[in-house]
């Protein structure tokens, strides 16, 4: 491990379409990948009229957009589907939306999936 870097070995797993995809709905996902690559966690969600609906959470492959990010934060302004990634075990348990373009006070929506 490189000093100061959070190695990601497992992430929170959630799949809203678990029945269609034939997966578990929730759990812990071990992260696999080429040994020369970094690994991350991600979360995707939708904001339906102010209500947060998690789409998926899990492991994410080597991506410079995620390097050295200990928190999972979406910065894109009003995306259709929100996405964030981070480094460190289970770092996708909580996620937030802080749009970079926003002039008004940004709001944070830390969310953990409710058990089925």
């Amino acid at each position: 491990a490189i000093l100061g870097r959070s190695e990601t070995q497992e992430c929170l797993f959630f799949n809203a379409n678990w029945e269609r995809d034939r997966t578990n709905q929730t759990g812990v996902e071990p992260c696999y990948g080429d040994k020369d690559k970094r690994r991350h966690c991600f979360a995707t969600w939708k904001n339906i009229s102010g209500s947060i609906e998690i789409v998926k959470q899990g492991c994410w492959l080597d991506d410079i957009n995620c390097y050295d990010r200990t928190d999972c934060i979406e910065k894109k302004d009003s995306p259709e589907v929100y996405f964030c990634c981070c480094e460190g075990n289970m770092c996708n348990e909580k996620f937030s939306y802080f749009p970079e373009m926003e002039v008004t006070q940004p709001t944070s929506n830390p969310v953990t999936p409710k058990p089925p």
């Epitope: 696999y32 990948g33 080429d34 690559k37 991600f42 995707t44 789409v55 998926k56 899990g58 492991c59 994410w60 492959l61 080597d62 991506d63 410079i64 957009n65 894109k76 995306p79 259709e80 589907v81 929100y82 996405f83």
Partner: antibody
């Protein structure tokens, strides 16, 4: 092992559209991006665009903006690249590649645009 | 995004070393360690040789190395072998907020 298998060669008329598929296996499809790259005969590589396979978010090269659409079907682990208003200069081999680092590539799909 | 600049061709004898350059701007090559190098043999898909400026994928011989100085990235191949004769392309990471761009390609001839 990671594999990206693309659809077969296509011959198209100018003005028409083509849709090339890229079926992924050997890894979790929703854990990365799929990029699309093309290579005209005897020419270099040209980046067309990318899709985040889990969120569906896309980015396109300015040159192809408005003419290319990249989609992903997570239920079949397949990405698609559709190019419209084809012209002869679009004759090329079209590749899909996994992730932002383009670490695995499809075998390529030759699209020939000819009247 | 304009294409990265590579020499059209380079050559070397077996056992020698060659270096291929890839020049961009402060906003692509110069801004971060996200330059990749690919090897392409005729009629084949490109093969990643170096990513993130200097990281080598498993299976790639350590004769291949990458570096960067300012806005120029370089691929060095030492102990040239006949099978190294191919086209080499530099390119950038593409995904999220990053847009991809490739160099024009360099034809390496092993004399």
């Amino acid at each position: 092992q990671v594999q990206l298998v693309q659809s077969g060669a296509e011959v198209k008329k100018p003005g028409s559209s083509v849709k090339v598929s890229c079926k992924a296996s050997g890894y979790t499809f929703t854990s990365s991006y799929i990029n699309w790259v093309r290579q005209a005969p005897g020419q270099g590589l040209e980046w067309m665009g990318t899709i985040n396979a889990v969120s569906g978010s896309t980015s396109y090269a300015q040159k192809f903006q408005g003419r290319v659409t990249i989609t992903a079907d997570t239920s079949t682990s397949t990405a698609y690249m559709e190019l419209s208003s084809l012209r002869s200069e679009d004759t090329a081999v079209y590749y899909c590649a996994r992730g932002g680092w383009f670490d695995y590539w499809g075998q390529g799909t030759l699209v020939t645009v000819s009247s | 995004q304009s294409a990265l600049t590579q020499p059209r061709s380079v050559s070397g004898s077996p056992g020698q070393s060659v270096t291929i350059s890839c020049t961009g701007t402060s906003s692509d090559v110069g801004s971060a360690n996200y330059v990749n190098w690919y090897q392409q043999h005729p009629g084949k898909a490109p093969k990643p040789m170096i990513y993130g400026v200097s990281r080598r994928p498993s299976g790639v011989p350590d004769r291949f190395s990458g570096s960067k100085s300012g806005n120029t990235a370089s691929l060095t191949i030492s102990g040239l072998q006949a099978e190294d004769e191919a086209d080499y392309y530099c390119g950038t990471f593409a995904g999220g907020k990053y847009y991809g761009v490739f160099g024009g390609g360099t034809k390496l001839t092993v004399l």
